[in-house]
Amino acid sequence: EPCVEVVPNITYQCMELNFYKIPDNLPFSTKNLDLSFNPLRHLGSYSFFSFPELQVLDLSRCEIQTIEDGAYQSLSHLSTLILTGNPIQSLALGAFSGLSSLQKLVAVETNLASLENFPIGHLKTLKELNVAHNLIQSFKLPEYFSNLTNLEHLDLSSNKIQSIYCTDLRVLHQMPLLNLSLDLSLNPMNFIQPGAFKEIRLHKLTLRNNFDSLNVMKTCIQGLAGLEVHRLVLGEFRNEGNLEKFDKSALEGLCNLTIEEFRLAYLDYYLDDIIDLFNCLTNVSSFSLVSVTIERVKDFSYNFGWQHLELVNCKFGQFPTLKLKSLKRLTFTSNKGGNAFSEVDLPSLEFLDLSRNGLSFKGCCSQSDFGTTSLKYLDLSFNGVITMSSNFLGLEQLEHLDFQHSNLKQMSEFSVFLSLRNLIYLDISHTHTRVAFNGIFNGLSSLEVLKMAGNSFQENFLPDIFTELRNLTFLDLSQCQLEQLSPTAFNSLSSLQVLNMSHNNFFSLDTFPYKCLNSLQVLDYSLNHIMTSKKQELQHFPSSLAFLNLTQNDFACTCEHQSFLQWIKDQRQLLVEVERMECATPSDKQGMPVLSLNITCQMNK
Amino acid sequence: QKQYWVCNSSDASISYTYCDKMQYPISINVNPCIELKRSKGLLHIFYIPRRDLKQLYFNLYITVNTMNLPKRKEVICRGSDDDYSFCRALKGETVNTTISFSFKGIKFSKGKYKCVVEAISGSPEEMLFCLEFVILHQPNSN
């Protein structure tokens, strides 16, 4: 069975084709080659001689036991080599020779027992080394690491490392890899020698499910003393063994580290006193809790110095009391419990993401809700009922506002967005909004993107509601049950580039409403019920138009519509996916491509 | 279509078939077997994925005695610092994991429950596997 040609001459997918040898019938120019799940078993020297341009090579699960000297010789452009799941028994010293551009090497689950004997010291361009899920017992980074000056990611997770000694990291003292991210999760650690990490700088250190008791965790974290880390991730996994006990003593050792950003990711334990628990983390710039349960929600009003707080997928008894002077960014998403939003006091806040919490807002939105006048980004999407009772007084700095898939109430009772003259992006898609007031978008003079799909309009008619939106470049009106539109609805939108009118209920097409759209490039009218044109003579769309989508409509392919069908043919160079433009009627022409119709009508009336 | 038996409990019998062309082998054990009246146990899965599990989610299509419930989407792996360790599993890497589960207080009516599980992962998204579970529920006297 031949390989699948994904991109001609470039990308070939040869997965699971029972190949015993490297195929020789693929073009020399191949850049991406997936040979995974083939029983190759043995790679001799110059195995890939036929593919000098290769950039990505996937050899996952190829039953490879032996890799000889120079197996990849000639692959001087290869940037990614994937060897996952091969039971390698013999790896020649020159196995990886010739890989002068290699940036990513994945040797996950390859029976690797030690980094010392892994022949990669010459791979100077290497940025990412993934040796997770192996049999490595020693964390000693061999001397050759001093050659790997570009290394940014080292994944040693799911190995057998139990202890870390001062000598293990000597090479990092000699040539500090300032940008190195190190993942040691799922190693059964019980000892980190104090001083092992002294004066070491890491970009990121991840330690999840490393400790089988609170005491071990405590002493190991104390062993990290002197480490300077940009981002520290601690925690567990839901499907691995979890700590039976967790208290404030666990993290006391963090006081001896310099940490910029901290994240606790999954803990099968109720956190009650977070002030004591995170006492050593009051001055990190970014603090993040993922998938934890928090009992006392008042603690977030303590004088933490965080600039970014992230609470994701957590459980709360009620919406937390948030009073944090220095906080600039708050991400509070996908949490459970506390369904009603309560006011927060965050005077420096500029970015607020409250999406996907099922929250309801009794009154939205003004400065008093968030305790700030600096807000630029507000995401309230995928929540419950949000009642609009104020038009963003004190929130005039907003540039990005997202309500999608929440249930907005009182949207047509006053000009909700009147204060938002700096707003650039607005998404009110699928918010149960029924537009019954022409002033709904008054005030939005800077708006560039408006998404309002999945709403409805009085009498299914689009009125002149966009008159002030002179900077609009993107407008989505799909799934709005629209049937008619004002001929002047779009007259002020001279900057509009993309207009999505798909999935509405138009029976006919009219070019007249678009005559002022001098910048329009994309017009999508797919999934309507267009049968013909509104007027006999259709004018041209704006000359800027590059893509016109009329697919999945109800074209009536009869002589009476000859001029419309001919007009469609004349637009051929604009039309996308023409094969999905089919006749719906009459029954003998149903399913025929509109563009293949021979429209020569004998008018036998 | 070959049917794979999972287990029997006092009130349920569970089996599955593949609903995709690939039919890549997957081993599923439940211990103890699920009782629909209330249950607590361990689900053990052994599987070698044909693509990375990053951003794994399930589409669930549940049928209760021929009545279709709305499609449910269950996100398992968000893409960074995920709850489950297998979320970091790569294409071709052995996934050998045990997941605890528990539920209680749901009353199910007697009959045939079908659940099509479409596993989608990766970027771009593609189907990882598709399994159709059949649960025959025979509530006992209490």
């Epitope: 009498e459 299914n460 008619f461 008619q484 209920n505 138009f506 029976f507 109800d554 719906a584 | -």
Partner: nanobody
Framework: EVQLVESGGGLVQAGGSLRLSCVAS????????MGWFRQAPGKERDIVAR????????YYAESVRGRFTISRDNAKNTVYLQMNSLRPEDTGVYYC????????????WGQGTQVTVSS
């Protein structure tokens, strides 16, 4: 399952009038487009008129424009076709059609009702 049942067909003289009715049962179709197709003897089935769920939009084939009127009563789940100034070429079987609530066009069909216009 949705069922469409037409009535009102029959024999009429040229210049006369008929009113066709179509009742939908099985589920409410108040939001979907409905319409009438005609199959004249020896010809293909083709659309005559169509109306949106809100009655805001209508479409008529050129041959019936000004003579036929499509309307609907959503409370009764019924769509009508008022046919005036009938001509012999209007003879045929008239079918009621409805889109699916998901938006698929011409998803449900009635069995048809015969209209014969004699000269």
């Amino acid at each position: 399952e949705v069922q469409l049942v037409e009535s009102g067909g029959g024999l009429v003289q040229a210049g006369g009038s008929l009113r066709l009715s179509c009742v939908a049962s099985g589920r409410t179709l108040s939001t979907v487009n409905m319409g009438w197709f005609r199959q004249a003897p020896g010809k293909e089935r083709d659309i005559v008129a169509r109306i949106s769920g809100s009655s805001v939009s209508t479409y008529y084939a050129e041959s019936v424009r000004g003579r036929f009127t499509i309307s609907r009563d959503n409370a009764k789940n019924t769509v009508y076709l008022q046919m005036n100034s009938l001509r012999p070429e209007d003879t045929g079987v008239y079918y009621c059609v409805a889109d699916s609530p998901g938006g698929r066009s011409y998803e449900y069909w009635g069995q048809g009702t015969q209209v014969t216009v004699s000269s």
